[in-house]
């Protein structure tokens, strides 16, 4: 058993029917001695007396908040949750293995630059008592400072038959180079309740690692005389790092027709201009990637043809 | 249809070039000894990320540009950043601080350079012959050398009396992959930005 | 005391379906994930299908994906396995299992697909 | 399909040391806990070692288990008539998990 903060706690179990659970002692946090009673969550029914309480903790009933009184008065709360470990493995029912980029990836984060900021997010089918707690820092055994903000819920889908929800949080390197090179990763780690459920959840990478650069700005088409050619520019994103000619993009160019089954032309280009021929119903779209760094392409950036 | 990109004019600045190639060779190296061995622990993940230049060099330092100079966490080991202007090119006129830059991009390489022949020297004895280094990246890495044109006393090649451990030699391999790409990338940013300045 | 009793299997034609059920008592049910296993006549064992504890998950192996679903009723304390377009190479003894570091195995129940 | 390999079979007279060793890989054994199941011919599998070196109550102290880097073993100290059977390591694997990974399975004859 272990504080999670003031007056709660988390029961580690090793989860399996007829596991013999885990004893717990509580004590009412009181100066008094005499005349103390116990009850669990809203029954009234008297679970023992004396200043500690010693419980068997087994199943989820036997979580919950056990309060300590006297004579009609709340003396002091314990809330008690449960942390389950099937199998040598701690449990993740809460959140959604998203399976980007592999298997059992619970927490996806990317960043638009190398400043030390970067935003996580989540899923889960939970819509009710549910909160979340996040922590980061740059590595484990010295960790160094991240400042992550509240975990918000950022979005809402329809999945089949079930709705499913998305949680993002924010979170900033107190003291980033953007043009160190990382050798400590970024720990990432989420605390989930659900009613009296428990679950923690980790997610360890270099920032170089998740770059994500917003899409190109600006993309503008200029019509070359006397040709079916155009000439394609388009500009750094603002949130991408500074100076552009240390912290490079490459972009691709594509060419697409109306429909999805059309061939499409591409063209890889460190310029922030190329030229292409712009078919009739096409659409250019231009992508943007670290020059120098292969990690995530930019989503893409569109205007039509015509 | 994928076509090729266009490679910028590399008469002006030829470290630039060189830089490129090399970030090039050392990324197809990694991936090569990724696939080749895949039952090490060679992935990103699972590697202890060691820097061999570390406190021997100080290149993210030295070569700092002067944009971020005003950023407070990138000047905490360092007292002056480089005032960019000039190139690999002999003919012009280098700064002081460009030159230490440089010099300390020619340390880097020396640096990876004995430790890639001294490894490549190990693997050459597995009975294995799983993996050796690529030719084309240790030339690279020379040609770069030759184009920063330092003269720097010859470090010797480290030779070792005792029964190589292949496994360990392996896992290092990675460990060394892994950094140097990681410096090849900033060696890359840093051409690119003395090639704008 | 866990218990865990199996029924449903049988012989079959190729191409054919069959049902096996689990019925489980001596514990909280629907606390528990539960997992199908099978082991053919003189071969090793073979993990099939995973459940979570409310149904919101399955696993499947991939020699049974698309073919067999896993399933639960909660609030009957059993276990399903449904499998459709058998093949000869289904031919086994199946048991259904509880999933944490102490498990508990069914009896096993032989399914057989022959013409 | 099996990514737990075992040797096919192993034998030892009564009273002997018998080891049955299972190999496996980073993302399976080496990341996650081993089993060791015994299976009787016609019955169900019964659980001997859980969490790599941990006995269910019941288990005689003659079976122990044991894990290093990458493979697992079950040892049989002063083996019995009544231990001959067949013996299965079970884990996971970090990329399938709750998938149930099986060892090829080793006979165990008492000559």
């Known amino acids: 058993i272990w504080e999670l903060k003031k007056d709660v706690y988390v029961v580690e179990l090793d989860w399996y029917p007829d596991a013999p659970g885990e004893m717990v002692v509580l004590t009412c946090d009181t100066p008094e001695e005499d005349g103390i009673t116990w009850t669990l969550d809203q029954s009234s029914e008297v679970l023992g007396s004396g200043k500690t309480l010693t419980i068997q903790v087994k199943e989820f009933g036997d979580a919950g908040q056990y309060t300590c009184h006297k004579g009609g008065e709340v003396l002091s709360h314990s809330l008690l949750l449960l942390h389950k470990k099937e199998d040598g493995i701690w449990s993740t029912d809460i959140l959604k293995d998203q399976k980007e980029p592999k298997n059992k990836t619970f927490l996806r984060c990317e960043a638009k630059n190398y400043s030390g900021r970067f935003t996580c997010w989540w899923l889960t089918t939970i819509s009710t008592d549910l909160t979340f707690s996040v922590k980061s820092s740059r590595g484990s055994s010295d960790p160094q400072g991240v400042t992550c903000g509240a975990a918000t819920l950022s979005a809402e889908r329809v999945r089949g038959d079930n709705k499913e929800y998305e949680y993002s949080v924010e979170c900033q390197e107190d003291s980033a180079c953007p043009a160190a090179e990382e050798s400590l990763p970024i720990e990432v780690m989420v605390d989930a309740v659900h009613k009296l459920k428990y679950e923690n959840y980790t997610s360890s990478f270099f920032i170089r690692d998740i770059i994500k650069p917003d899409p190109p700005k600006n993309l503008q088409l200029k019509p070359l005389k006397n040709s079916r050619q155009v000439e394609v520019s388009w500009e750094y994103p603002d949130t991408w790092s500074t100076p552009h000619s240390y912290f490079s993009l490459t972009f691709c160019v594509q060419v697409q027709g109306k429909s999805k089954r059309e061939k499409k032309d591409r063209v890889f280009t460190d310029k922030t201009s190329a030229t292409v021929i712009c078919r009739k119903n096409a659409s250019i779209s231009v992508r943007a990637q670290d020059r120098y760094y292969s990690s995530s392409w930019s989503e893409w950036a569109s205007v039509p043809c015509s | 249809r994928n076509l090729p990109v266009a490679t910028p004019d590399p008469g002006m600045f030829p470290c630039l070039h060189h830089s490129q190639n090399l970030l090039r060779a050392v990324s197809n190296m990694l991936q090569k000894a990724r696939q080749t061995l895949e039952f090490y622990p060679c992935t990103s993940e699972e590697i202890d990320h060691e820097d061999i230049t570390k406190d021997k060099t100080s290149t993210v330092e030295a070569c700092l540009p002067l944009e971020l100079t005003k950023n407070e966490s990138c000047l905490n080991s360092r007292e002056t950043s480089f005032i960019t202007n000039g190139s690999c090119l002999a003919s012009r006129k280098t700064s002081f601080m460009m030159a230490l830059c440089l010099s300390s991009i020619y340390e880097d390489l020396k640096m990876y350079q004995v430790e890639f022949k001294t490894m490549n020297a190990k693997l050459l004895m597995d009975p294995k012959r799983q993996i050796f280094l690529d030719q084309n990246m240790l030339a690279v890495i020379d040609e770069l050398m030759q184009a920063l044109n330092f003269n720097s006393e010859t470090v010797p090649q480290k030779s070792s009396l005792e029964e190589p451990d292949f496994y360990k030699t392996k896992i290092k391999l990675c460990i060394l992959l892994h950094a140097f790409r990681i410096r090849a990338v900033t060696i890359d940013r840093v051409m690119s930005y003395l090639n704008a300045s | 005391q866990v218990q865990l009793v199996q029924s449903g299997g049988g012989v079959v034609q190729p191409g054919r379906s069959l049902r096996l059920s689990c019925a489980a008592s001596g514990f909280t049910f629907s606390s528990y994930g539960m997992h199908w296993v099978r082991q053919a006549p003189g071969k090793g064992l073979e993990w099939v299908a995973f459940?979570?504890?409310?149904?919101?998950?399955?696993y499947y192996a991939d020699s049974v994906k698309g073919r067999f679903t896993i399933s639960r009723d909660n609030s009957k304390n059993t276990l399903y396995l449904q499998m459709k377009s058998l093949r000869a190479e289904d031919t086994a003894v199946y048991y259904c299992?509880?999933?944490?570091?102490?498990?508990?195995w069914g009896q096993g129940t032989m399914v057989t697909v022959s013409s | 399909s099996y990514v737990l390999t075992q040797p096919p079979s192993v034998s030892g007279t009564p009273g002997q040391r018998v080891t049955i060793s299972c190999s496996g890989g980073r993302s399976n054994i080496g990341n996650n806990t081993v089993k060791w199941y015994q299976q009787l011919p016609g019955t169900a599998p019964k659980l001997l070692i859980y969490?790599?070196?941990q006995r269910p109550s019941g288990v005689p102290d003659r079976f122990s288990g044991s894990k290093s880097g990458t493979s697992a073993s079950l040892a049989i100290t002063g083996v019995q008539a009544e231990d001959e059977a067949d013996y299965y390591c079970?884990?996971?694997?970090?990329?399938?998990?709750?998938?149930?990974?099986f060892g090829t399975g080793t006979k165990v004859t008492v000559l």
């Open positions: 459940i979570r504890y409310d149904g919101s998950n399955k």
């Open positions: 969490g790599n070196d």
């Open positions: 079970q884990s996971y694997d970090r990329g399938t998990h709750p998938a149930l990974l």
């Open positions: 299992k509880t999933h944490g570091s102490h498990d508990n």
